[in-house]
């Protein structure tokens, strides 16, 4: 399986909220011996490997933000801890998972990574990740709502 990032760049005004999204693609085994571990973290575009370094998002580590479930189930992270930091990560039945960040500040700008690990009974784990950039802007040049740029081309979309 692979991870797709529908949007590679999110440009948002300060104070707005944004939902960063990743989607599982390809043959996803939904057998009973398969579990998916999904999480989010900040990173940097490293020389060796983008998304290798795992930095916290608003002081929450990738362990704090992880989702764990079998192929059939939807899941949410522990709400209390995340929501206290204005965060919520979630996953649906269709392979899409996301992190929502409320009340954006300039400090939220940076590279964000989603990570999916497929855990199989008696097998090695299989990991894939996706990366996207968040730019939080302030002042007269800031958009009124978040503008997202699809990964495949640079056509932008407004999201409210």
């Amino acid at each position: 399986f692979k991870v797709a990032t529908p949007y590679s760049l999110y440009v948002c005004p300060e104070g707005q909220q944004v939902t960063l999204t990743c989607r599982l693609l390809g043959p996803v085994d939904k057998g009973h011996d398969v579990t998916f571990y999904k999480t989010w973290y900040r990173s940097s575009r490293g020389e060796v490997q983008t998304c290798s370094e795992r930095r916290p998002i608003r002081n929450l580590t990738f362990q704090d933000l992880h989702l764990h479930h079998g192929g059939h189930q939807a899941a949410n992270t522990s709400h209390d801890l995340a929501q206290r930091h204005g965060l919520e990560s979630a996953s649906d039945h269709h392979g899409q998972f996301s992190i929502t960040m409320r009340n954006l500040t300039l400090l939220d700008s940076g590279l964000y990574c989603c990570l999916v690990v497929e855990i199989r009974h008696h097998h090695s784990e299989h990991r894939v990740h996706g990366a996207m950039e968040l730019q939080v802007q302030t002042g007269k040049d800031a958009p009124s709502n978040c503008v997202v740029y699809p990964s495949s081309s640079q056509d932008s979309e407004n999201i409210t």
Epitope: Q63, H68, S78, I119, R120, H121, H122, H123, E125
Partner: antibody, heavy 117, light 107 residues
Framework: QVQLQESGPGLVKPSETLSLTCTVS????????WSWIRQPPGKGLEWIGY???????NYNPSLKSRVTISVDTSKSQFSLKLSSVTAADTAVYYC???????????WGQGTMVIVSS | EIVLTQSPATLSLSPGERATLSCRAS??????LAWYQQKPGQAPRLLIY???NRATGIPARFSGSGSGTDFTLTISSLEPEDFAVYYC?????????FGGGTKVEIK
């Protein structure tokens, strides 16, 4: 912060079964692989195997026929059973939390198990 | 099974000196390699994950490099508390395996 504590007998007779338990405190047992690693006196580290909260297991082939790892989520414990032990199984046994696609980030303090008659 | 070979087995250095530890894999492990420090009577402690990223709370004097089959752990200037045994560990394939260790001792 997750903490781990191993418990079990420090002396086991040859041909018997070694049984150890690791108690997890300060965190959810649903967040990690739960692994056992051992270290014979003066030697290096050997991964025995893990269990994920979902029940998925993975064992070192060198020990697979003798190893069972189980989890009791209600007690926040996971256990190791190693059958038909010999003197070569004498080691410090560590339990550790192993985050998927990451590393062994938290370890118990280790418990010495001697196999001797 | 992937075999990790660490060299040298023992490294004798003085505080303040630079330590360079090597770990070589029998086949490529990409960058899925961790380093641990173990002091006598203690459990190992995670230093580096994914070849070159410092774990939380690890001082900047520790750095990792490499990918594929050849990896290096460097301690830029040895502090007295750094004298210990260091292990590398791969996680690209099961079983998970560790190197035999490098002991960094006081000269």
């Amino acid at each position: 912060q997750v903490q781990l504590q191993e418990s079990g007998p420090g002396l086991v007779k040859p041909s018997e079964t070694l049984s150890l338990t690791c108690t997890v405190s300060g965190g959810s047992i649903s967040s990690y692989y739960w692994s056992w690693i051992r270290q014979p006196p003066g030697k290096g580290l050997e991964w025995i195997g893990y269990i994920y909260y979902s029940g998925s297991t993975n064992y070192n082939p060198s020990l697979k026929s003798r190893v069972t790892i189980s989890v009791d989520t209600s007690k926040s414990q996971f256990s190791l059973k190693l059958s038909s032990v010999t003197a070569a199984d004498t080691a410090v046994y560590y339990c550790a939390s192993d985050i998927p696609a990451f590393a062994f980030d938290i370890w118990g303090q280790g418990t010495m198990v001697i196999v001797s008659s | 099974e992937i075999v990790l070979t660490q060299s040298p087995a023992t490294l004798s250095l003085s505080p303040g000196e630079r330590a360079t530890l090597s770990c070589r894999a029998s086949q490529s492990v990409s960058y899925y390699l961790a380093w641990y420090q173990q002091k006598p009577g203690q459990a190992p402690r995670l230093l580096i994950y994914d070849a070159f990223n410092r774990a939380t709370g690890i001082p900047a004097r520790f750095s990792g490099s490499g990918s594929g089959t050849d990896f290096t752990l460097t301690i830029s200037s040895l502090e007295p508390e750094d004298f210990a045994v260091y292990y590398c560990q791969q996680r690209i394939n099961w079983p998970l395996t560790f190197g035999g260790g490098t002991k960094v001792e006081i000269k």
